[in-house]
Each structure stands twice: as C-alpha cells, then as structure tokens.
Interface confidence: medium
C-alpha cells in the first residue's frame, strides 16, 4: 500500500497529508487484488495533480471514487475507460479548470460531485450545466467558474453563444422488412458546435456498413436477418454539451420456422411442447394421424411464452388415453410461407395388455424362462421417467 | 411343458364363418394376453386381434374389425376366434400365441384357413 | 397405417456376420421384436426390447436400435439359421401390432 495510504481487500484510503501522495496510488504486485478493490478515497493530497489514462484501469470492481481537497488539475479523456462499475465520483475542491463529459460518457454514473472547482467558463463544460438541469433540483449543486473578467458566476446562469445541445433526425422508411431484403436509413445531425454523427445498431445481426460525412450520414442494411426483428437502431449526433438520438425499430417479416417439437411430457396436463418462430404471428394448425384436429377443451393449444416473434407453447391433452396415440403434426402458417413438423406420441398402451399382464402375477416376464432378471436388460430407453412394464415403448412412461 | 394346441381350421365358403380354438398347456392361461397372427400363403406375418390377461380387453386390425371376436375362457384354458363373413383375402394359416409385454414368446403349431367358392 | 419396412432378401457366407434392418416411423417410439421362422413351421421369438434374447437363443443374435431403424445382426451366421426373419412393433398411434415384410436369410 503506498505511503499516506492505508488498504485493505476491497477499499483504498490516502488522507494523511504528510508526506502524501504525488500519483494516483497503485498496488505492489503482490499485494491485494486491484479487482476486488470497489472504494479509493483520497484527500488532503495537494500534490496529487493529474490521473493518467492507466492510473485507474487495474480497478475494474471500483464502484466509488473520491479525491477531495486535493490538487487535481487533469484527468486523462481515457482514465475511466476500463471503470465500467463505476457509480459515484466525488472531486469536490480540487483545481479542475476544465472537465470533457467523453471521460464519462460510457459510465452510468449516478452520482458526480464537482464543487469547488476553479472551473474556466467555456463550452467545454457547458455539459455540466446540461447535466444539472436534467437532474432533480435536491441534487444540484452551487458550480461557479470563472469568466474573462475572471469573476466568478453561477454554473446555472452561463451563456455562451453557438454551445448547445446537438439534434439527430432520423428519416427512416417503412421499417417493416421481409426477411432477405435490404434498406438504406438516412440521418441528418445539427448543432453548434457542429456535431459528430454515428450509428448505434446494437447487436444488429445483418450485415451493415455505414457513410457519414460530418452531419450526413446513411446506414444500408442488406440481407436483412429474421434475428433482428424488435431491434432499435439508432442514429447519434454528440457534441461538447451533449448528444441527441433519433431512433427506430426494425420489423422483419418472415415466415415460420418450428425450431422445436418434442414428445408429450406429462405434469398438469399432457403437454405435446413447440417452438414457433415467424412474423407475422403464425397462424397454428395440428393434425392427428394425417387428419386436422378439431380442438376442444380436451386437446387444445396454448402459447405459454411469446418473446418477441418466438412462441412457445404446447398441444394440451387432458386425460389422453391409447386412443391418443399417434403422429401429431404441427402446420405454422402465415403470408411468407409454412413449416410443418411431426412426432410420434405415446400416451399409454393397452389397457389390460401393456399394464404388465395379470397385476397379480408381477412375475410374467420370467415365467418359464429361468432367466435372472438383470438377463432382461435394459428395456427401456432414453428416459429417465417412470420406469414401463412395457420394453416395446422406448419412451419409459408407465402404461 | 408350455404349448398351445390349435384346431378347427377348414376350407368354407366366403361369407360363411368358422370358429378357430387353442387349448394352452404347461403355463397359468389366465396371466397372458393372447393373439392371433395369421399367413397367407408365401406372404409375411400379419397380426389379427389380442385379448387381455381376463378377456375384459380386446383389440382388431382394421383388416378383421367387425367380423372376428377373439375371446376365452381362462376355467378352460382356451382361445378362439370367431370368423364371420369370411373372405377370400383372409385364406392363411392362423397362430395363436402368447402375448407378454414384450412380444410373442409362445406360438401355436398354426392351422390353415382356406376361403373358396 | 404406418409399415415397418424390410429387405425382401440377404445372404451372407458360413461364419460371417450379417445385419437385416427393419424402418419405421413408430420404431421411434416402440422397439421391435425379431421372430425367426423356418418352412412350415411357427415363428420363433429371438430378439425383444433393446437387445434381449429369450433363453435358449444363442448369443450370436443380438438387436439395436437407431431412430427409425432396428437391426437384428447374427455374427458368425451358421447354416441353421437359415430362415424368414420378421420385425415386429406397434404402428405410430400404438393401437395395431405390425409386422415387417419378412428378410429371407441365405446362409452360403
């Protein structure tokens, strides 16, 4: 632990001011883990005056950073880069004259303390005005700088001409896409002063590329993918004093795909379970045997999970009986196309015939046989559900 | 030892009927379904009916339903099938066997069933 | 009605292993049974559930079971065993018995 410092496993705190600190304190190699490190507290340190971009990026866990009555004039635009925990930054009455809103722009901070500061007024810190006004009154605080008369002026009565939040326009078609298709969004930033403009497609699984010019900027998405259906696309114009974003969701269309049909499980109810994929909604129809199955209260379908253009859901059977069994074939249906799927369910056998014969005689299957019963081997297969009487069902339900 | 003895097969006119039996020996009857299996002359296997462990089940192919009733009679030891309405496709040699939850274990000698005007 | 599907007919040399298949869509939920059945006489059960052989058949026979499709294979074939050979299940609704065609075995 640095001198004028004491640490432990997870806090770090420098407020002796003799003989203090000069840099951002760092841990011996071999010492506590910087990961596991959530709090640095430093105060009293005048000859701390600068975090370098590499000062802080060992504490990837650092929650609360605190540097108070202290000399700090700069801090690195890249310092908290590697911070992404981080929530509550306090630089109360350092000697910061400026601040950049791009070392915290990637943070969701929700706390940032800044009296005190011999801030310079300028557009460069006209985003800390943006930032208190956004906030509710209880949190804002008495910020000062200093102007050409060097005289010092309320943060919140600051007017600098030609500093002022960006805009973004989005001109966005009919985002409604079918699957494979391709389409180009256009986007118009403004601002003074002027604004960069960027795309902000999240995890967009189709291919894009982008052209942007200062504050013109087009994105063409081609082969549209059926992944990106309920996806927002963004188009960000950011300035010194802030950004704006224009947004829209992308709508695929495609047709349905049955990514899951599986045999019947039984917990309430007899539930034959399916995964549907499709958009619009795929309009559901089974048949049984190769004939359409009229649902009843009996056998009917029921989607238990829709996310987005994904169902999930079962045929419920109440009560089925052998005269159940059979193929079940799942048809999904809509505008773009259809995909069907079949399995084979297995409800229960014979009544009187699979049960095992004579219930009163458990012994049938190795009458005059003279085998062991471990001869019988494993006659039963691929479940781990009640064990059958009956080795001709694979499925190891109990008849 | 364990056996089951067929008779009363013969050739009849189609749409007439005829009774088909088998005596089980050597084993407790009345602990098995029992079916029977029919063959037509140089063609394969084709199951005909079953009947539960005490008659109380009993199940047809589509090919004999309506027209053959398998029953027992588990004081006797015995197994029929009643054919009605009979056909020239149904002409074969007839089994019973013993039915366990896993196939047939025991089968009949087969008797043959000849449908001819 | 679903089938159970065989080959009309395989042969296979004195001492060497041969494999009949039998395919169907309910073998994806039943297993098969396997009878053998030589001229004018009853079938015989050799082969039940995964792979179970009644006492007395030899251990030259054994079953399996892929999805669809049951094999019955006999390793080191011998002149006896010579003979129709049968598959047997349920259809897909579990409400019939079916047998397969019959694979008739030559055994040179």
């Known amino acids: 632990c640095p001198t004028s410092c004491k640490c432990s496993a997870s806090r770090i705190w420098c407020s002796d001011p003799s003989p203090g600190i000069v840099a951002f304190p760092r841990l011996e190699p071999n010492s506590v883990d910087p990961e596991n490190i959530t709090e640095i507290f430093i105060a009293n340190q005048k000859r701390l005056e600068i975090i370098n971009e590499d000062d802080v990026e060992a504490y990837v866990g650092l929650r609360n950073l605190t540097i108070v009555d202290s000399g700090l004039k700069f801090v690195a635009h890249k310092a908290f880069l590697k911070n992404s925990n981080l929530q509550h930054i306090n630089f109360t009455r350092n000697k910061l004259t400026s601040l950049s809103r791009k070392h915290f722009r990637h943070l969701d901070l929700s706390e940032l303390i800044l009296v005190g500061n011999p801030f310079t007024c300028s557009c460069d810190i006209m985003w800390i005005k943006t930032l208190q006004e956004a906030k509710s009154s209880p949190d804002t605080q008495d910020l000062y700088c200093l102007n050409e008369s060097s005289k010092n002026i309320p943060l919140a009565n600051l007017q600098i001409p030609n500093c002022g939040l960006p805009s973004a326009n989005l001109a966005a078609p009919n985002l409604t896409v079918e699957e494979g298709k391709s389409i180009t969004l256009s986007c118009s930033v403004a601002g003074d002063p002027v604004p960069n403009m960027y795309w902000d497609v999240g995890n967009l699984v189709s291919k894009h590329m982008n052209e942007t010019s200062h504050t013109q900027g087009s994105l063409r998405i081609t082969n549209i993918s059926s992944d990106d259906s309920g996806k927002q696309i963004s188009c960000v114009a950011e300035n010194l004093v802030g950004e704006d974003q224009d947004s829209v969701n992308l709508t695929v269309h495609f047709a349905p795909t049955i990514t899951f049909l599986e045999s019947p499980t039984s917990d309430h109810h007899w539930c034959i379970p399916f995964t549907v994929k499709g958009n619009p909604k795929p309009a559901l129809q089974w048949f049984y045997n190769g004939a359409i199955l009229n649902e009843s209260k009996y056998i009917c379908t029921k989607i238990h999970v829709t996310n987005h253009t994904e169902y999930h859901g079962c045929l419920q059977l109440d009560n089925p009986t052998h005269m159940n069994n059979g193929d079940y074939t799942l048809i999904a249906k809509n505008e773009y196309g259809k995909d069907e799927k079949q399995i084979s369910a297995h409800f229960m056998g014979w009544p009187g015939i699979d049960d095992g014969a004579n219930p009163n005689y458990p012994d049938v299957i190795y009458e005059d046989y003279g085998t062991a019963a471990n001869d019988i081997g494993d006659t039963t297969n691929r479940s781990n559900e009640i064990p059958s009487t009956d080795v001709t069902d694979k499925t190891g339900r109990e008849h | 030892q364990v056996q089951l003895q067929q008779s009363g097969g013969g050739v009849v006119q189609p749409g007439r009927s005829l009774r088909l039996s088998c005596a089980a020996s050597g084993f407790t009857f009345s602990n098995y379904a029992m079916h029977w299996v029919r063959q037509a002359p140089g063609k394969g296997l084709e199951w005909v009916a079953v009947i539960s462990y005490d008659g109380s089940n009993e199940y047809y192919a589509d090919s004999v339903k309506g027209r053959f009733t398998i029953s027992r009679d588990n004081s006797r030891n015995t197994l029929d099938l009643q054919m009605n309405s009979l056909r020239a496709e149904d002409t074969a040699v007839y089994y019973c066997a013993r039915g366990t939850n896993y196939g047939m274990d025991v089968w009949g000698q087969g008797t043959m069933v000849t449908v001819s005007s | 009605l679903s089938e159970l599907t065989q080959d009309p007919a395989v042969s296979v040399a004195l001492g060497q292993t041969v494999r009949i298949t039998c395919q169907g869509d309910?073998?994806?939920?039943?297993?098969a049974s396997w009878y053998q059945q030589k001229p004018g006489q009853a079938p015989v059960l050799v082969i039940y559930?995964?792979?179970n052989r009644p006492s007395g058949i030899p251990d030259r026979f054994s079953g399996s079971d892929s999805g669809k499709t049951a094999s019955l294979t006999i390793t080191g074939a011998q002149a006896e065993d010579e003979a129709d050979y049968y598959c047997?299940?349920?259809?897909?609704?579990?409400?019939?018995?079916?047998f397969g065609g019959g694979t008739k075995l030559t055994v040179l």
């Open positions: 309910s073998l994806r939920s039943y297993y």
């Open positions: 047997q299940s349920r259809d897909t609704t579990g409400n019939y018995l079916l």
């Open positions: 559930g995964k792979n």
